[in-house]
């Protein structure tokens, strides 16, 4: 009817102007819509240029909404990562500070002459925790070998101990068990505790990294058209008050975010594995108990060496021969008093329990992040209709939306009526991130069993993918040992996004 043909475009002018566009583009009254490429071609208040501007704007608004949702998740993961990292580093730093404060009094020169070896051990533990590609068991074995060499020389200043004799001492060491049970106990407990701590924190880092990278995946042109139709075509067609039908919105966003929804299974697996590994934070081999008590194992070891000195010396002489005596050297070192230190078991501070319960709750909350994203964005960002079904915008007019809601993920979009999705072409960035989630989940599962996946030959298949941007400093190219010259492949999982807290230490 002629009256409807000349309906005013006042409301559209208002909305279009509010978006910052020039009002000179907007017709005063409706015009014929044959020129429209996205919206239905009825009478319209939108020119070609307006349709294009609004299409670009709707695309940008969806990407912004997507990034905002991702940013909230990233911020939560980053906060968790920082809290746990601070706590674990604090435990280790506390242990080192206790050692520096108590060992000089407890052990005198047996400590002060070897302070560098102890400092190095803590630095290596710190590096290992932060993702350096080093073998923890080898690191500990090396530490004990170096310490034995130095302490044996100190306890026998009257003996001439050339390198070949010290080499022989080193070869005998394993059988002699000079430090008693401490090295074995520390190795078993520290390996489990550090592997659990570092893999959990790495898990948070990988999750955060995945969210960040996925948020940068551009939305395709088919999605842009569908979102324009969803958000702004009602305005162009003179029904600016009509809000999108909920199921219509879900179908558009399920089509747009089909690839993202494919992260769901591996995302859940990762979060489940992370929740599971927190079980390893408790008990005598737990993270808090072990990382905070490294110094007590070291004290036990030195005490054991002093207690076993005479037996040890006799066995070394038996295996390596009689060393020459330095005629000008002093007599044997006086047996020192045993170093008295606080008991090994640290009373739990409560901090870790609080951190873990918060983390578990938050990780559970975001388990369905990827599949709930279309629904979340529709309800929070798209101003959905709450009116009865036949009063909402269905993409063509005000009325009921009849198609069924699609399932989640790429494969389920084959018949999506709103977005043309090529299910044979998955997004490669998202596939890579699915692989990163899988790799990290495997690390966590290995860590749950007390194994460090980096040093299981079975997993060393030479393959692997990933951004490679997670390594701090040049940790990832580190060689693994002073004795062997083998090096390993770089890691891709050293705490992404974590800045080095402990810089180079100078003294």
């Amino acid at each position: 009817d002629p009256a409807s043909k000349s309906r005013s475009c006042g409301e559209v002018r208002q909305i279009y102007g509010a978006k910052g566009f020039s009002l000179s583009d907007v017709p005063q009254a409706e015009i014929s819509g044959e020129h429209l490429r996205i919206c239905p071609q009825g009478y319209t208040c939108c020119t070609s240029e307006m349709e294009e501007n609004l299409a670009n704007r709707s695309h940008a608004e969806l990407e912004t909404a997507l990034r905002d949702s991702s940013r909230v998740l990233q911020a939560m993961l980053a906060t968790q990562l920082r809290s746990f990292d601070d706590h674990f580093q604090h435990l280790l730093n506390d242990s080192e500070r206790t050692l520096q404060a108590t060992f000089p009094g407890a052990f005198g020169e047996l400590y002060t002459q070897n302070a560098r070896a102890f400092r190095d051990l803590y630095s290596e533990l710190r590096l290992y925790y932060r993702g350096a590609n080093l073998h923890l068991e080898e690191t500990l074995a090396e530490f004990w070998a170096r310490l034995l060499e130095r302490l044996f020389k100190q306890l026998h200043p009257q003996l001439l101990l050339p390198d070949d004799y010290l080499d022989c001492l080193g070869k005998q060491a394993e059988a002699l068990r000079p430090f008693g049970e401490a090295p074995r106990e520390l190795r078993l407990r520290a390996t489990r505790a550090f592997v659990a701590a570092r893999s959990f924190v790495q898990g948070l880092g990988v999750a955060s990294d995945v969210v960040r990278k996925v948020a940068q995946v551009p939305l395709g042109p088919e999605c842009s058209r569908a979102v324009m139709k969803l958000v702004y075509c009602a305005h162009c067609l003179g029904v600016p008050g009509a809000r999108p039908c909920p199921d219509y919105c879900r179908n558009v966003l399920k089509g747009c975010l089909a690839n993202q929804a494919d992260l769901d299974a591996e995302w859940r697996n990762l979060l489940d594995s992370m929740v599971l590994i927190t079980d390893k934070f408790w008990g005598t081999s737990g993270v808090e108990s072990v990382i905070g008590s490294v110094h007590t194992w070291l004290a036990e070891a030195i005490n054991a060496l002093q207690d076993n000195r005479d037996t040890l010396t006799a066995k070394v002489i038996q295996g390596c021969g009689n060393p020459k005596v330095n005629p000008q050297g002093p007599g044997p070192e006086e047996k020192r008093r045993r170093g008295k230190l606080a008991p090994r078991e640290r009373p739990p501070s409560g901090t870790l329990e609080k951190l873990v319960s918060e983390a578990k709750a938050q990780l559970r909350d975001v388990q369905d992040f990827w599949i709930s994203l279309p629904g979340t964005l529709c309800s929070e960002k798209m101003a959905l209709s709450t009116a009865s079904d036949d009063r909402c915008w269905n993409g063509m007019a005000r009325g009921r939306y009849l198609p069924e809601v699609m399932g989640d993920g790429l494969a389920n979009q084959i018949n999506n009526p709103e977005v043309e999705v090529d299910i044979t072409k998955p997004d490669m960035t998202i596939r890579q991130q699915i692989m990163q989630l899988k790799i990290m989940t495997n690390r966590l599962r290995s860590a749950y069993n007390g194994n460090d996946v980096d040093f299981q030959d079975a997993s060393d298949d030479g393959s692997g993918s990933g951004s490679g941007d997670g390594c701090l400093d040049d940790l990832c190219s580190r060689k693994v040992s002073r004795k062997s010259s083998s090096s390993r492949t770089p890691l891709t999982h050293a705490l992404p996004g974590l800045s080095e807290q402990e810089g180079q230490k100078t003294s």
Epitope: T112, Q113, R116, A117, R119, D120, S123, E124, R126, L127, L134, R146, E149, R150, K153, Q154, P157, L160, L161, P162, D163, L166, N326, G329, D473, R478, K479, S481, R482, K483, S484, S485, Q504, K505, T506, S507
Partner: antibody, heavy 119, light 107 residues
Amino acid sequence: QVQLVQSGAEVKKPGASVKVSCKASGYTFTGYYMHWVRQAPGQGLEWMGEINPSTGDTTYNQKFKARVTMTRDTSTSTVYMELSSLRSEDTAVYYCAREKRDDGVFAYWGQGTLVTVSS
Amino acid sequence: AIQMTQSPASLSASLGDRITITCRTSQTVAGYLNWYQQTPGNAPKLLIYSASNLQSGVPSRFSGSGSGRDFSLTISSLQSEDSATYYCQHSYSTPYTFGQGTKVEIK
């Protein structure tokens, strides 16, 4: 066999900085501390500091602490010594030296790098 | 820092002579004392470590002794290639320090 190869001679103006490199080969680079020792013309040897190539931890002689920075690059098995705010008395041959074992004994030395500070 | 005092500052001896250089430290360094030889234009070379251990490849005419604060380096039969400056160094604790050197010349 263990080899330490240092960068070439440098001529610097007072107030400038110099960065000397020392490339290691023939052993596991991260397994042994590396030290820097300097020797002014006709003078004795002076220890400047040490770096643990495995961890990057450093210990400097108090005399140089404000001006020296030791770093390492494990991917190229190279350590670096940078000395800033150069003055004429920093004219010297700078040596890198590797420990024998974990013992502060310098069993292997670089060939030396002459740094001349002159206006 | 531990001070190192070497004596003599220089000495001149004939081929085949036995010579001794001493090194005294300002505080005990236990047995953590090392000796180096340096010829003009070359880097120092380790001779003796931990007061009395001969570094591999060093001729047996070189020997070291001492403990605590007093140490000595002895060349039992001086050879022409021994003309050099000799330095003691402690590795007891940082900062490691060197003696001022003893210049040995052949008469």
